[in-house]
């Protein structure tokens, strides 16, 4: 913490301007009034403060707003945003997309994924839901940031907004997030024709249940291996060899290349070896011919 000193009269600050770059840390602490700083935050980013000086300015704002900064200050943080921790940001209430845009621009090129994720979370909370304007802002200024939101936050996305989401925006989404988004996408694209539907639903298929994957296998979609390997393990395991062959079409050859990777490996182990042999790919590890498969989990459920 910066030690408290009294401000020399000749150093008194009446406005935030470039002269402050010549102030030492303790002079900034003693001479800059926090309320003046907050009122003139829009000037701060144009002044080439050192990171040490920015630390002092942050400290002043923290003292003035222990419960979190008001949006009027947040909007003009500029490079001071780089000094914020997720804990600082968690105290904010942000509703303006202009504020979000400004801070996303500042964070670009810096390792701030945790701060950005928290900021986006605060915006969604502040606006009440993940509306189309918010999604459009995220896709434009922060591709992939949609996936920084928790499944709980993503559940506030109305299906009507799903069309604005691009495949690259879902790239870093995990299974739990896709579990939330997939049913919304299914609803949003339900009136589309087969091939158009597949193109749209494909990035969301990591959240699809087995029955939907089975249905796709009947539609000549020729699913690529990248999509197949994003499917939930639980959705892939019950598929038959014939269903996987239909689902992948000409891409079925790729199973050989990926046979060591989950979920392909897990699926192979569940198939009869003679069924796998019908693919002619040399896939190994299936259940040997003549073996009986007992599903003990079913028996336990009955007893």
């Amino acid at each position: 913490d910066v030690e408290r000193t009294t401000c020399p009269p000749e150093k008194e600050v009446h406005e935030i301007d470039e002269s402050l770059i010549f102030y030492k840390k303790r002079e900034l602490e003693a001479c800059v009034d926090a309320a003046l700083l907050a009122a003139q935050m829009d000037r701060v980013d144009a002044i080439p403060f050192t990171y040490e000086q920015l630390d002092v300015l942050k400290h002043k704002l923290d003292e003035l707003y222990p419960q979190g900064y008001p949006e009027s200050v947040i909007r003009h943080l500029g490079h001071l945003f780089l000094k914020m921790s997720p804990e600082d940001i968690r105290k904010w209430n942000v509703t303006s997309l202009e504020t979000l845009k400004a801070l996303l621009k500042v964070s670009k090129g810096h390792e701030m994924s945790a701060q950005v994720a928290t900021l986006i979370d605060r915006v969604v909370v502040g606006r009440g839901q993940l509306d189309k304007d918010t999604v459009d802002t995220l896709t434009a200024f922060c591709p992939g940031c949609l996936c920084s939101l928790s499944p709980e936050r993503l559940s506030s996305v109305p299906p009507s907004v799903i069309g604005a989401v691009r495949p690259q925006d879902l790239d870093t989404c995990g299974p739990r997030q896709l579990d939330v988004l997939y049913p919304k996408a299914r609803l949003a694209f339900q009136n589309m024709s087969g091939s158009e539907y597949f193109v749209k639903i494909r990035p969301f298929l990591g959240g699809a249940p087995t029955e939907d994957v089975k249905a796709l296998s009947q539609q000549n979609v020729s699913m690529d291996l990248a999509t197949f390997m994003k499917l939930r393990r639980e959705a892939v395991l019950p598929l038959t060899v014939a269903e996987v062959q239909k689902l992948l079409g000409p891409h079925v050859e790729g199973l050989k290349v990926e046979e060591q990777h989950s979920p392909v490996r897990d699926w192979i182990l569940k198939q009869r070896q003679d069924d796998l042999d019908t693919l002619g790919l040399g896939l190994q590890g299936g259940i040997p011919n003549g073996y009986l498969i007992l599903d003990l989990s079913v028996r336990e459920a009955l007893s």
């Epitope: 790239d171 990248a226 199973l255 050989k256 990926e258 060591q260 989950s262």
Partner: antibody, heavy 119, light 106 residues
Framework: EVQLQQSGPELVKPGTSVKILCKAS????????MDWVKQRHGQSLEWIGD????????IYNQKFEGKAILTVDKSSSTAYMELRSLTSEDTAVYYC????????????WGQGTTLTVSS | QIVLTQSPAIMSASPGEKVTMTCSVN?????IYWYQQKPGSSPRLLIH???NLASGVPVRFSGSGSGTSYSLTISRMEAEDAATYYC?????????FGGGTKLEIK
Amino acid sequence: EVQLQQSGPELVKPGTSVKILCKASGDTFTAYNMDWVKQRHGQSLEWIGDINPNTDSTIYNQKFEGKAILTVDKSSSTAYMELRSLTSEDTAVYYCARRKLGRGYFDYWGQGTTLTVSS
Amino acid sequence: QIVLTQSPAIMSASPGEKVTMTCSVNLSVRYIYWYQQKPGSSPRLLIHDTSNLASGVPVRFSGSGSGTSYSLTISRMEAEDAATYYCQQWSSFPYTFGGGTKLEIK
């Protein structure tokens, strides 16, 4: 334009570990596996292993099991390879190479990271 | 493990000359892939799925073969083709490369 940018050369002591990174740009990171290949001076190429960024599923050439640890960070489109218990035999150039899921070839390669293990 | 044997290990050719190098496999494989590597550079994909030219590769390069015998041909040697060429297989685990053919310009 697709690029795989690897970390710089490393000079390390025997018995230590090193972590090499490979940052991908210009395409969908999760549509490709990231593979790693070793090349000792004047010798051929040796496949170390690969990782699927979607599932973090890894496979290793048995020869490098326990020697190499592959990880990815999807949020930064970066793949990592940690090499442990280093000996002079690990002195080589290490390449990351991108492999489209379901395809058996490497369409883009990093520039290589030279690792020298010497006391 | 599948072993890929490339021959010759070293060869030289004059500009304009036709060049053929081979990759023999100890077990039948579905496809072979070919790479070119120049000193101090990374390998570059030339041919995938035995005979398909990779993006940006000159048409003087071609690949052929099946089963256990594969070859790479350069219809007319150019100075910039001086490099080491490697074949690779992905039909069986672990995935292996040949020992390389070093092609020099006469």
